[in-house]
């Protein structure tokens, strides 16, 4: 299964929008500064495409559902949160149409559940941490610079699965 | 009974390698993530690697990455560390340790082996 | 990594007395520390993890309580059988890290 060239672009406008979508600056939240223990062991110890396009996928449904929460749209500008869905939603059908093809469902396909669990995991802190900082702007901005850091990560493992082949 | 028992410790010359084992029995191994701690004689502990229930993730020590390499057989209950460019600095006893959950963090090691003592030495 | 910081080193009390140690980590770790202990000559053995959760076979004279960055082990009531090290360890994210220990002494 080949992604589109329009994934591609999606991923790279996902990123545009969350740089958009900055409110404050980084730097008048030092304080809130936190490492998340983002699991980057999952997006490099699989060599094949079939064995990320899970984990790929988990990664961006769970973007998705931290971003499409009350205390999210109460945190972000409405339009840009909109247009934030739109691409993700279109991320996740072309990775779940390459699963549809049976990529993904290789001879392996438990050694996976321990990297879908490790991104299940890292979301679980980062939902704790807002829960624990009261959704406060500081804290989204920490989570959204995060998020573009921990997306922009799983994103360049595509590009590079991708100039493999 | 709940057990995990270590082998394969034993005196080793700098720069050389060694390969711990543990078997497990007592609990269905395939479910949990497992780890290795270590502790230097009379020091504290320190943790060394994971590895997750089915074997796909794994996570190390910064002092240990490029070096160590943990690895599991579920089907015999097994869990390894293949440990190279050994150093004075590795003497300790490995603890062989059972996580609470399938993959590491956010979790406990609620179950220790008795340990095995890796001495490096010349 | 995530600094864990554990006092004191060691102390001494008597049979019946209240004993507090204290661990700090250097960022939240939500709830995720966990405390050991470790008697001489033997392997660790978890007593609380997720910060106040006793393990079962865990005497309730011992508890633990904190978030966030601070945590405290008590032992209401110390027992001779106590006598051993004690260990903090944060299981948030890896590497895990462990406090350097406390070594609780009967008087």
């Known amino acids: 299964c080949d992604l589109p060239q329009t994934h591609s672009l999606g991923s790279r406008r996902t990123l545009m929008l969350l740089a958009q979508m900055r409110r404050i600056s980084l730097f008048s939240c030092l304080k809130d500064r936190h490492d998340f223990g983002f699991p980057q062991e999952e997006f490099g110890n699989q060599f094949q495409k079939a064995e990320t396009i899970p984990v790929l996928h988990e990664m961006i449904q769970q973007i998705f559902n931290l971003f499409s929460t009350k205390d999210s749209s109460a945190a972000w500008d409405e339009t840009l949160l909109d247009k934030f869905y739109t691409e993700l939603y279109q991320q996740l059908n072309d990775l779940e149409a390459c699963v549809i093809q049976g990529v993904g469902v290789t001879e392996t396909p438990l050694m996976k559940e321990d990297s879908i669990l490790a991104v299940r995991k890292y979301f679980q802190r980062i939902t704790l941490y807002l829960k624990e900082k009261k959704y406060s702007p500081c804290a989204w901005e920490v989570v959204r610079a995060e998020i573009m850091r921990s997306f922009s990560l799983s994103t360049n493992l595509q590009e590079s699965l991708r100039s493999k082949e | 009974e709940m057990q995990l028992m270590e082998s394969g410790g034993g005196l080793v010359q700098p720069g050389g390698s060694l390969r711990l084992s543990c078997v497990a029995s007592?609990?269905?191994?395939?479910?949990?993530?497992m780890s290795w701690v270590r502790q230097a004689p009379g020091k504290g502990l320190e943790w060394v690697a994971s590895?997750?229930?089915?074997?796909?993730?794994?996570y190390y020590a910064p002092s240990v990455k490029g070096r160590f390499s943990i690895s599991r057989d579920n089907s015999n209950n097994t869990l390894y560390v293949q440990m190279n460019s050994l150093g004075v600095e590795d003497t300790a006893f490995y603890y062989c340790?059972?996580?609470?959950?399938?993959?590491?963090?956010?979790?406990?090691?609620?179950?220790w082996g008795q340990g095995t003592l890796v001495i490096v030495s010349t | 990594d995530i600094r864990v910081t554990q006092s004191p080193s060691s102390l001494s009390a008597s049979v019946g007395d209240r004993v507090s140690i204290s661990c700090q980590t250097s960022?939240?770790?939500?709830?995720?520390l966990n405390w050991y202990q470790q008697r001489p000559g033997k392997g660790p053995q978890l007593l609380i993890s997720?910060?106040?959760t006793l393990q079962s076979g865990v005497p309730s004279r011992f508890s633990g309580s904190g978030s966030g960055t601070d945590f405290i082990l008590t032992i209401i009531s110390l027992q001779p059988e106590d006598s051993a090290s004690y260990y903090c360890q944060q299981g948030y994210i890896t590497p895990y890290t462990f406090g350097q220990g406390t070594k609780v002494e009967i008087k």
């Open positions: 960022q939240s770790v939500n709830i995720y």
């Open positions: 997720a910060a106040s």
């Open positions: 007592g609990f269905t191994f395939k479910s949990f993530a």
């Open positions: 590895v997750g229930s089915q074997g796909g993730s794994k």
């Open positions: 340790v059972k996580e609470t959950d399938a993959v590491a963090t956010m979790d406990a090691l609620d179950m």
